[in-house]
Interface confidence: low
């Protein structure tokens, strides 16, 4: 929707005479009528499909037009339109004379035309005004004109409708090509979405206006990060709302059973270790020389028999001494010096003398280790799972658990990118070696399919009422020439019906 | 909030016009178009036509062409809508309807108002 | 003879599933979003679902819309028994250019 605008500047006609050449008497009162529509490469007569126009009687002769109402008549012309402007146009303007005051056609003389001009070509929306001088053998006219969009209309061609508005519907302005550009605070596609404060959890909570934070039940904090966990839980916590799970060492429901005794009481003494046994139950493992249930008694400390392999016990003012006997050696006499008579390598490990078989190394089968073969080798120590995948020991056998996207045994195999469904528009997919080509309909380009392509606006057959459909090459839009009696963008409209649908 | 009062119950005669009124209330009257719906009594929802309060221009189903006339008063915040010509089968509840609508395109009666009931009887 | 298609009744117990079909055409629901409205008897309309399943505020999420094609269905899980009222379906139609609706759902909880 957008207005034609026609600013009549100065006409001449110095020996005041009409188009056939006859003299006016006594001078030639001057009025103009103005005809636009859809172009032409040959201007030729026939409805005003754009729309028409007549001033008042602006002057005789020559005279220079005031750019303000003149007359009753207003200066600039106005010729409201209420479809896409096409970009293009032709213009007739007819200067006559008014021998009386009836300026109706029926009501003038079929000789009283002065001049008339014509022109056609193309013209774009825009604030300025182009300026054209039109002389025939008599007349000069000199003019400009310009489209430009009506209120809350926007866009190269007056086709996209903005109205601003700070209501539960939406809070924006328009941009000079349409779009909305939302008030500080609002988000979205039409701006109906609050901006919630900064750190808001996208999930848990939510706001109605902006810089607001609203926790969803079972979330608090400013932030809405915290969960509420179920009443009565004591010593637990959670990660998603009525949750209470159990801080270490706490049990029930409620976490209110003590299951880590040791930690909160610490019962044992002189050092023992404390080991949880249950509810409110333990064990305490006494060190050398202590005895009772929480090695609250000391004892001889060669009572226990602390020294291995033969070795002899001698108390000691701070604690005791074990002699060894030939071959042991250690604290507690438990370290041997072996060799590889003594078959020291567990597993089927192969031994080998070292110094002058003074000591020893073992060479370990597969799947074992350690400086006598004792240890089992983790499988997943060498990482065999492809693609970020994680090593999960499970008995005699490895396995890999994979990332999303990714499957097979060591998560090696693409999962088909076209599982997505990533074409746009009813685009077929096809699996490449390294990602997806899309095949796209007619209508429809680009590497997804988003992008739509030239098509013929007029093939719906949009126009009603028997109404000529032109297409608009350039912006794959469409101008209906609408017959006598009927308009709007697509002619849908008995004269007298403005349109104004919101949709 | 958002109100629309109708004008109370008709009773006209065959031929007759009436004009029935809806004052808006509770947001900016200029900003939402409003629509004229009837029901007959026992039927369903008939859409009439729509009004834009801003400039006033309007747009009428094809069926109510030349007998219906939608009106406005914005210092009143009001829109009227006026049919002639009644005979006995507009005998309906005729409601307003504020409609709010973005590029998507959709109809949204979103707002209504509490309805009038016009009876065409000789 | 309303332009979208409904059935005139539907019926369901407290606490079933129940659903409201609205059949139309490519120049109405086929191109156009769909909304659905409640009407209990002597009171005006009110909207229950907007482009197709949206739900205004206010509304219980029992009540869910959906679209496919030319054709429009509405669910309501959980029946309640004051649920009991005449649904419509309505479109904007491209040809004539206007609201369309479909002619009432009777709806009774037994």
């Known amino acids: 929707s957008g207005v034609f605008q026609l600013q009549l500047q100065e006409f001449i006609n110095e020996r005041g005479v009409l188009a056939s050449g006859r003299p006016c008497e006594p001078g030639c009162r001057t009025f103009f009528r103005v005809c636009l529509k859809h172009f032409q490469a040959v201007v030729s007569p026939g409805p005003c499909t754009f729309g028409t126009v007549s001033t008042p009687v602006l002057g005789t002769n020559s005279f220079a037009v005031r750019d303000d109402s003149s007359g009753g008549g207003r200066n600039p012309l106005q010729l409201p339109f209420n479809f896409t402007w096409p970009g293009t146009f032709s213009l007739i303007i007819e200067a006559w004379h008014a021998p009386g005051d009836d300026l109706r056609p029926e009501a003038l003389p079929p000789d009283a035309l002065i001049s008339k001009i014509a022109i056609q070509g193309s013209l774009a929306v825009g604030q300025n005004w182009l300026l054209d001088e039109q002389t025939s053998t008599l007349t000069r006219l000199r003019y400009s004109y310009r489209v430009i969009c009506s209120d809350n209309y926007y866009g190269d061609n007056c086709s996209r409708l903005c109205k601003k508005r700070n209501d539960h519907f939406g809070h924006y302005v328009c941009q000079p090509d349409g779009n909305l550009s939302c008030l500080p605070g609002w988000t979205g596609e039409y701006c109906q979405q609050p901006i919630c404060l900064s750190g808001c959890h996208e999930q848990n909570g939510y706001c109605s206006k902006p810089a607001e934070c609203l926790c969803r039940p079972g979330w608090q904090g400013r932030l809405c990060n915290e969960c509420i966990p179920h009443n009565g839980c004591r010593h637990g916590t959670c990660s998603t709302p009525w949750q209470c799970t159990c801080d270490e060492g706490w049990g029930g429901l409620f976490c209110d059973q003590d299951l880590n005794y040791c930690t909160h009481h610490s019962p044992c003494k002189n050092g023992a270790t404390c080991s949880n046994s249950g509810q409110r139950s333990y064990t305490c493992t006494c060190r050398p020389g202590y005895t009772g249930v929480d090695c609250e008694l000391e004892l001889s400390e060669c009572d226990s028999n602390p020294c291995r392999n033969g070795g002899s016990c001698k108390d000691q003012e701070d604690g005791y001494h074990c002699l060894c006997p030939p071959g042991y050696y250690g604290l507690h006499c438990e370290h041997s010096t072996l060799s590889c008579a003594d078959s020291p390598c567990f597993n089927g490990g192969s031994c080998r003398e070292r110094n002058q078989g003074a000591n020893y190394a073992c060479e370990c089968p597969p799947n074992f280790t350690g400086s006598n073969c004792e240890k089992k080798v983790d499988r997943c120590t060498s990482n065999p799972c492809a693609n970020g995948g994680q090593c999960l020991n499970r008995g005699p056998s490895r396995m890999c658990r994979c990332r999303p996207g990714f499957t097979g045994t060591y998560c090696e195999l693409h999962v088909s990118d076209c599982a997505r469904n990533p074409c746009a528009h009813g685009g077929t997919c096809h699996d490449l070696e390294n990602g997806l080509m899309c095949t796209c309909p007619a209508g429809f380009s680009g590497r997804r399919c988003e992008v739509r392509t030239s098509i013929d606006a007029c093939a719906s057959s949009p126009c009603f009422n028997r109404a000529t459909c032109y297409t608009d090459l350039s912006t794959d839009t469409f101008v209906c020439n609408c017959p006598y009696g009927f308009v709007g963008s697509r002619c849908e409209f008995p004269v007298g019906l403005p349109p104004s649908f919101p949709w | 909030q958002v109100q629309l009062v109708q004008s109370g119950s008709e009773l006209k005669k065959p031929g007759a016009s009436v004009k029935v009124s809806c004052k808006a209330s509770?947001?900016?009257?200029?900003?939402?178009?409003m629509h004229w719906v009837r029901q007959v009594p026992g039927q369903g929802l008939e859409w009439m036509g729509i009004i834009n309060p801003s400039g006033g221009s309007t747009s009428y189903a094809q069926k109510f062409q030349g007998r219906v006339t939608m009106t406005r008063d914005t210092s009143t915040s009001t829109v009227y809508m006026e049919l002639s010509s009644l005979r006995s089968e507009d005998t309906a509840v005729y409601y307003c309807?504020?409609?709010?609508?973005?590029?998507?395109?959709?109809?949204?009666?979103?707002?209504w108002g509490q309805g009038t009931l016009v009876t065409v009887s000789s | 003879q309303s332009v979208l298609t409904q059935p005139p009744s539907a019926s369901g117990t407290p606490g079933q599933r129940v659903t409201i079909s609205c059949s139309g055409s490519s120049s109405n629901i086929g191109s156009n979003t769909v909304n659905w409205y409640q009407q209990f008897p002597g009171t005006a309309p009110k909207l229950l679902i907007y482009?197709?399943?949206q739900r205004p505020s206010g509304v219980p999420d029992r009540f869910s819309g959906s679209k496919s094609g030319t054709s429009a269905s509405l669910a309501i899980s959980g029946l309640q028994s004051e649920d009991e009222a005449d649904y419509y379906c309505a479109a904007w139609d491209d040809s004539p250019n206007g609201p369309v609706f479909g002619g009432g759902t009777k709806l009774t909880v037994l």
């Open positions: 309807a504020t409609d709010y609508y973005d590029s998507s395109g959709y109809v949204d009666f979103d707002y």
């Open positions: 482009r197709n399943n």
């Open positions: 509770g947001y900016t009257f200029t900003s939402y178009y």
